[in-house]
Amino acid sequence: SQVSQNCHNGSYEISVLMMGNSAFAEPLKNLEDAVNEGLEIVRGRLQNAGLNVTVNATFMYSDGLIHNSGDCRSSTCEGLDLLRKISNAQRMGCVLIGPSCTYSTFQMYLDTELSYPMISAGSFGLSCDYKETLTRLMSPARKLMYFLVNFWKTNDLPFKTYSWSTSYVYKNGTETEDCFWYLNALEASVSYFSHELGFKVVLRQDKEFQDILMDHNRKSNVIIMCGGPEFLYKLKGDRAVAEDIVIILVDLFNDQYFEDNVTAPDYMKNVLVLTLSPGNSLLNSSFSRNLSPTKRDFALAYLNGILLFGHMLKIFLENGENITTPKFAHAFRNLTFEGYDGPVTLDDWGDVDSTMVLLYTSVDTKKYKVLLTYDTHVNKTYPVDMSPTFTWKNSKLPNDITGRGPQ
C-alpha cells in the first residue's frame, strides 16, 4: 500500500534499514556513524547553497528474532518485514537506504510499489540489474563480468598477446556475499561471461582446484576465484603450480595491496589480483577509524548514499520540483556527485562506476604492482606497466590453453 512520506515542507527524512542480515559483518553502530557523518556534510552543502531545510535519518531496526543468521542467507523476508514496520508506523522517508543483501533487495523491489528511490550498499547479484529506482553504490557483478570479458579478449598488449576463451571458476559455497554473487554471475549459463567463453567449468571442491594446478590434461590455464590472499593460501598452500597457470583473484574491496610496507607472499607469484583503485585516505575520518580496510567500502557506501540523496535534494529544490514524485524516484542515475572521497559516477542504471586495478607480483621486488586499470564507465583499459616483471615466461601472460600455437 502507498505509505505517506515524511518528505515535504522543508523537512526531509531518510529511512535507513538497519538489518541484522548484511552483506558485510559490520556493527550497525559503525553504519550509523557513517550515516550521521553524511548528514552533517549534506546539511552543510544545503546551507551553503542557501537552502534552509532540515534533513534527518530514521534508523529502522529489525527485531532479529526470526532473521538472525547475520549473513544474507535468511534476508529474503527481512527487508519486507522492515517495510511493513515502516508502513505501520507511517514513517517512510524520501529515500530508502538499505538493504545490502541481493535476496532482500530483489524481493523488496519485486513485492512493493516503489515510488521512492532505494539506495543499496551491496545487492551485487545480476537479479538486481536494471532496476529503475534502485541505486547500487558498490560494484555489482555486471561490472566485474564486463571487465573479465574485455580482459579475456585482449591480445594487443606486450604482456598479453593471446586472446583467452576458457576458464575455471572456483566456487565452494563459503564465499562472502560480494564473492558469492560475483562468482554466481560467472557461473550462470545465460550470463555475458558464459556467452563469450568457449569453455568454463566450476570447481566446487578444494581437491578439484588443487588437482588442476598440475594436471597436464587441464582444459584451461586460467582459474578465477574470489577472496583475499589468505583464502588462496588455505586452498593452495605451498603446492607446486604449473608454470602457465594464471589465477585471477577477485578482491575488490581490499585496499591493503596499496599499503607501502606490504610484501607479496611467494604463493601470489602466479596470481593477478583484481581490486578497486584506492580513494584518498579515509583513515582520519571519524566513521572509519575503527574499520578494517575491507569494511571501509561498505561504510563509505552508506555515507555516499546520504551524500547522493543530498545532491539530488539540492537539485530538485533549486529547480522548485517536488520530491515525492516518480521523477525524483527515477533520477538517481546517469550522474556524477561529490562523494566523501571524491567524485562518484552512476551509470544509466544507477550502478556505481569505478576504476578497477589489476595487480601482479613483481618477481624482482616481491611487491604488488599495477599492471593496468579499467574504467567501468567507458569500458576502457589503461595499461600501466608495459614491461612487467612477471613469473611467466618471456614476461607475457601465457595462452589459456596449453600447447595452442601463437595468435
Epitope: L157, P158, T161, T381
Partner: antibody
Framework: EFQLQQSGPELVKPGASVKISCKAS????????MNWVKQSNGKSLEWIGV????????NYNQKFKDKATLTVDQSSSTAYMQLNSLTSEDSAVYYC???????????WGQGTTLTVSS | QIVLTQSPAIMSASPGEKVTISCSAS?????MYWYQQKPGSSPKSWIY???NLASGVSARFSGSGSGTSYSLTISSMEAEDAATYYC?????????FGGGTKLEIK
C-alpha cells in the same frame, strides 16, 4: 583539443646534461602513459621509454637505461626527460608521445631539437 | 627485439595511382601500427591495430596483414599523401619502428 607542448631547442656541450619538458593539456594527464621517442637526423624512430603519471611506473628501452631519466609533475601535468653524459650521438629530435590504448603513440609533441657540440 | 623491415625505402607514385607499402617483421606479431610524417613535422598516428584508421585519416588509406607480413595501401594517390610512413610493433617489448618508406608524388 589536447596538446603536448615541448620545451625549446637545446645546444649543449659534450658531457653535460639536459632536461626536456612536455606540458600536457586538454586531457586527463594521469590516465595516459607518456612515451619518449628519439629521431636522429633523417633517420628512423627509436623508443626510449614510457612513464605512467598516476602510478609512477617507468619502463625503459635497455639501450637508453643509463642515458635517460623520466619523471613527471602531476600538479603541472608535465613530463620530463633528462639526458646525461651527452655525446654527439645524442644529437636528435626528441618527442614526447601520449598513449591512448589501443592506439599506441596516438598524439605527438612538436619535438625538441637537441644539438650536442663543443 | 623484433626488427621491422620496410620496403621500398623510397618510392614515387602518380596522382590516382594505387600505392602499397610493405612491412616485414622478424617474428610474428598480432598487430601493426602505422605513422605518417611530413618534413619539419611530428609523426602522426595513421593506422592502429593493423586496419583501424586514426581520427581524421582519409578512407583512401587501408591497412592489412598478419603474422610477419603487413601493408599500408592508398587506393588513389593524392599530393597530400606524399610523406614518410613508418610501421611499428608493440607485440614484444620494447616497441620498435621500421626504417620508414618515403613516398613522393610524381
Amino acid at each position: 583539443e589536447f596538446q603536448l607542448q615541448q620545451s625549446g631547442p637545446e645546444l649543449v656541450k659534450p658531457g653535460a646534461s639536459v632536461k626536456i619538458s612536455c606540458k600536457a593539456s586538454g586531457y586527463s594527464f594521469t590516465d595516459h602513459n607518456m612515451n619518449w621517442v628519439k629521431q636522429s637526423n633523417g633517420k628512423s624512430l627509436e623508443w626510449i621509454g614510457v612513464m605512467n603519471p598516476k602510478f609512477g611506473t617507468i619502463n625503459y628501452n635497455q639501450k637508453f637505461k643509463d642515458k635517460a631519466t623520466l619523471t613527471v609533475d602531476q600538479s603541472s601535468s608535465t613530463a620530463y626527460m633528462q639526458l646525461n653524459s651527452l655525446t654527439s650521438e645524442d644529437s636528435a629530435v626528441y618527442y614526447c608521445v601520449r598513449d591512448d590504448y589501443p592506439n599506441y603513440f596516438d598524439y605527438w609533441g612538436q619535438g625538441t631539437t637537441l644539438t650536442v657540440s663543443s | 627485439q623484433i626488427v621491422l623491415t620496410q620496403s621500398p625505402a623510397i618510392m614515387s607514385a602518380s596522382p590516382g595511382e594505387k600505392v602499397t607499402i610493405s612491412c616485414s617483421a622478424s617474428s610474428s606479431v598480432n598487430y601493426m601500427y602505422w605513422y605518417q610524417q611530413k618534413p619539419g613535422s611530428s609523426p602522426k598516428s595513421w593506422i592502429y591495430r593493423t586496419s583501424n584508421l586514426a581520427s581524421g585519416v582519409s578512407a583512401r588509406f587501408s591497412g592489412s596483414g598478419s603474422g610477419t607480413s603487413y601493408s599500408l595501401t592508398i587506393s588513389s594517390m593524392e599530393a597530400e599523401d606524399a610523406a614518410t610512413y613508418y610501421c611499428q610493433q608493440y607485440h614484444d617489448y620494447p616497441p620498435t619502428f621500421g626504417g620508414g618508406t618515403k613516398l613522393e608524388i610524381k
